[in-house]
């Protein structure tokens, strides 16, 4: 679509005659009558294919033509087209006399014909006016011609539409030649594709409005290269998203479980030594005088049971009194006035005689100690029961009664939830206080791992040489389609062609 | 335990000002994005900005651009919202969570009433 | 904006009975869908993420299914604790946008 245009810019008829060489009266009012249409070699009358266009009367004789576009469009003349420019025309200008006010061809004698030009030849679209000057015997004809392209049209012969947009479905200006011209900040076939914020990261990364960075779920940041750790995460930082790398001291799936609970909560009272030894675990080591988990518990004197030899022991508001069996004396009833003739060894015991008699020697069956084999053995002195179990004295044994959570002889076995494998697919489990958790491996979900879904094989792009690349969703792997010349699973493998 | 405490609602004419503040604790607070969410009977829960852990990069609704700041001090594990331009469509309860735009709202804090009245 | 509707808008249950709600998103926004339970009073807490993954400490009862546009959050045998209402929320486009909420009530 165009329109061909022609500027009339001077008609000289300096005797006022017609074609028939009769003069006007009083002179020749000029109009003209303008048939655009296909080439032909010899231009020959018939249909006007492209168009005609008539003037009203534009001066009398010899007269130049004003350029008037404002009233209707007069001047330059407008001949428009609804095709492609074919770049060949004929033009037909002929100079008509106006005796009276109309112009109808029906109107008009035959003889009122001034003067009738022919040109035809190749016109290509553009700006540029070509200027011609045709003469006769009595007239001459000046003016100027050329095809342009109509509004939205464009290209070589006004063939291309391009309409200039901006909004969601394209972004641009039209070139001369009908292509498109994206708008600052907008690429794409159709200018549709936001250009983000530069250093914006390609796949964590998007925009929907140009110098723009939105990230991807798991991603945060001006450019989108820093992950978000793991919503569960309390004392934790990624390196991809979602993961939970436990900061300094902290422990845990989740990294809330204390690794310098010692510092961070001072469990241990009565100036006892606190010892970590492990996750949200720690050992107290108890002055004297205190026991318990936290040595919160203080001890009577009496309970280290000082006093030997049968001797009972009586707690004082400074300390303790050991009240001595006949036969013995001492702070703590350690020295003895007795020999083996005494029979000073009890509960089975058997009795050696030391220096010449002076002195003796108990020798204790099992369960029984002190120097006169008084004591039973408490095999519980020791606390050999961990994670806060409870030390039981069972005859010649001991056994320890464990705190819920834990197992083993000495209770030093965690329970864990998840000795019964309860992932399926081969996701991870990991124990936590109140129970388990299942990391799942690419393909699974589920809080048990046993969702199947789908994954994209093909999102890390195996495939070489611009192979196709296609997802198999029921085993979840991934088929090349290779181009010709290159063979392999991969597509790596190029074939020696012919 | 995650505790996220606000403060600084109240009652503001139109066209003032107020700044909200979230205490955070419990959690390494630099290490997490941040956000706040409001909730009004008319509208509903509305995400209205967010800022980010590694760079401090903000985000907000289109409604508040331009009148509203989010900001964070790590020193003082506190995360802030300062509301200028107030308008009437502004009331509502504004919550401080944990998370992104682009993330879950992990933990929530008990939130604070803003109204916008004359 | 990608809009989050949720049905019913109430809904009124026995107890140990199952519950389902829906949430439809008007695009697709992938496994990016979060559920959230409100207390009267409280602040929402959130109960799942990545649709079907129940945050720390939610009880087994309640689970989320659903992918693309079409979600939903099943509650199965109902406990008094469990009368709230129940939010679905997106977190695949930006900006995060919230459903309307089911409130739910025990018959």
């Known amino acids: 679509s165009g329109v061909f245009q022609l500027q009339l810019q001077e008609f000289i008829n300096e005797r006022g005659v017609l074609a028939s060489g009769r003069p006007c009266e009083p002179g020749c009012r000029t109009f003209f009558r303008v048939c655009l249409k296909h080439f032909q070699a010899v231009v020959s009358p018939g249909p006007c294919t492209f168009g005609t266009v008539s003037t009203p009367v534009l001066g009398t004789n010899s007269f130049a033509v004003r350029d008037d576009s404002s009233g209707g469009g007069r001047n330059p003349l407008q001949l428009p087209f609804n095709f492609t420019w074919p770049g060949t025309f004929s033009l037909i200008i002929e100079a008509w006399h106006a005796p009276g006010d109309d112009l109808r061809p029906e109107a008009l004698p035959p003889d009122a014909l001034i003067s009738k030009i022919a040109i035809q030849g190749s016109l290509a679209v553009g700006q540029n006016w070509l200027l011609d000057e045709q003469t006769s015997t009595l007239t001459r004809l000046r003016y100027s011609y050329r095809v342009i392209c109509s509004d939205n049209y464009y290209g070589d012969n006004c063939s291309r539409l391009c309409k200039k947009r901006n909004d969601h479905f394209g972004h641009y200006v039209c070139q001369p030649d009908g292509n498109l011209s994206c708008l600052p900040g907008w690429t794409g076939e159709y200018c549709q594709q936001p250009i983000c914020l530069s250093g914006c990261h390609e796949q964590n990364g998007y925009c929907s409005k140009p110098a723009e960075c939105l990230c991807r779920p798991g991603w945060q940041g001006r450019l989108c290269n820093e992950c978000i750790p793991h919503n569960g995460c309390r004392h934790g930082t990624c390196s991809t998203p979602w993961q939970c790398t436990c900061d300094e001291g902290w422990g845990g799936l989740f990294c809330d479980q204390d690794l310098n609970y010692c510092t961070h909560h001072s469990p241990c009272k009565n100036g006892a030594t606190c010892s970590n030894s492990g996750q949200r675990s720690y050992t107290c080591t108890c002055r004297p005088g205190y026991t318990g988990v936290d040595c919160e518990l203080e001890l009577s004197e009496c309970d280290s049971n000082p006093c030997r030899n049968g001797g009972s022991c009586k707690d004082q508001e400074d300390g303790y009194h050991c009240l001595c069996p006949p036969g013995y004396y001492g702070l703590h009833c350690e020295h003895s006035t007795l020999s083996c003739a005494d029979s000073p060894c009890f509960n089975g015991g058997s009795c050696r005689e030391r220096n010449q008699g002076a002195n003796y020697a108990c020798e204790c069956p099992p369960n029984f100690t002190g120097s006169n084999c008084e004591k039973k053995v408490d095999r519980c002195t020791s606390n050999p029961c961990a994670n806060g179990g409870q030390c039981l004295n069972r005859g010649p044994s001991r056994m320890c009664r464990c705190r819920p959570g834990f197992t083993g002889t000495y209770c030093e076995l965690h329970v864990s939830d998840c000795a019964r494998n309860p992932c399926a697919h081969g996701g991870t489990c990991h124990d936590l206080e109140n129970g388990l958790m299942c990391t799942c491996p690419a393909g699974f979900s589920g809080r048990r791992c046993e969702v199947r879904t789908s994954i994209d094989a093909c999102a890390s792009s195996p495939c070489f040489n611009r192979a196709t690349c296609y997802t198999d969703l029921s085993t979840d792997t991934f088929v090349c389609n290779c181009p010709y010349g290159f063979v392999g699973s991969r597509c790596e493998f190029p074939v020696g062609l012919p | 335990e995650v505790q996220l405490v606000e403060s600084g609602g109240g009652l503001v004419q139109p066209a003032n000002s107020l700044k909200l503040s979230c205490a955070a604790s419990g959690f390494t607070f630099s290490n997490f994005p941040m956000a706040w969410v409001r909730q009004s009977p008319k509208k509903g829960l509305e995400w209205v900005a967010t800022?980010?852990?590694?760079?401090?990069?903000?985000y907000y609704r289109d409604s508040v651009k331009g009148r509203f700041t989010i900001s964070r001090d790590n020193a003082k594990n506190t995360l802030y919202l300062q509301m200028d331009s107030l308008r009437s469509e502004d009331t509502a309860t504004y919550y401080c969570?944990?998370?992104?735009?682009?993330?879950?709202?992990?933990?929530w804090g008990q939130g604070v009433l803003v109204t916008v009245s004359s | 904006d990608i809009r989050m509707t949720q049905s019913p808008a109430s809904l009124s249950a026995s107890l140990g009975e199952t519950v389902n709600i829906e949430c439809r998103a008007s695009e697709d926004i992938y496994s990016n869908l979060a559920w959230y339970q409100q207390k009267p009073g409280k602040a929402p807490q959130l109960l799942i993420y990545d649709t079907n993954n129940l945050a720390d400490g939610v009880p087994s009862r309640f689970s989320g299914s659903g992918s693309g546009t079409q979600f939903s959050l099943k509650i199965n045998s109902l406990q008094s604790e469990d009368v709230a209402t129940y939010y679905c929320q997106q977190y695949n486009n930006y900006p995060p946008t919230f459903g309307g909420g089911t409130k739910l009530e025990l018959k």
């Open positions: 969570a944990r998370g992104y735009y682009n993330s879950p709202f992990a933990y």
């Open positions: 800022i980010s852990s590694s760079d401090g990069t903000t």
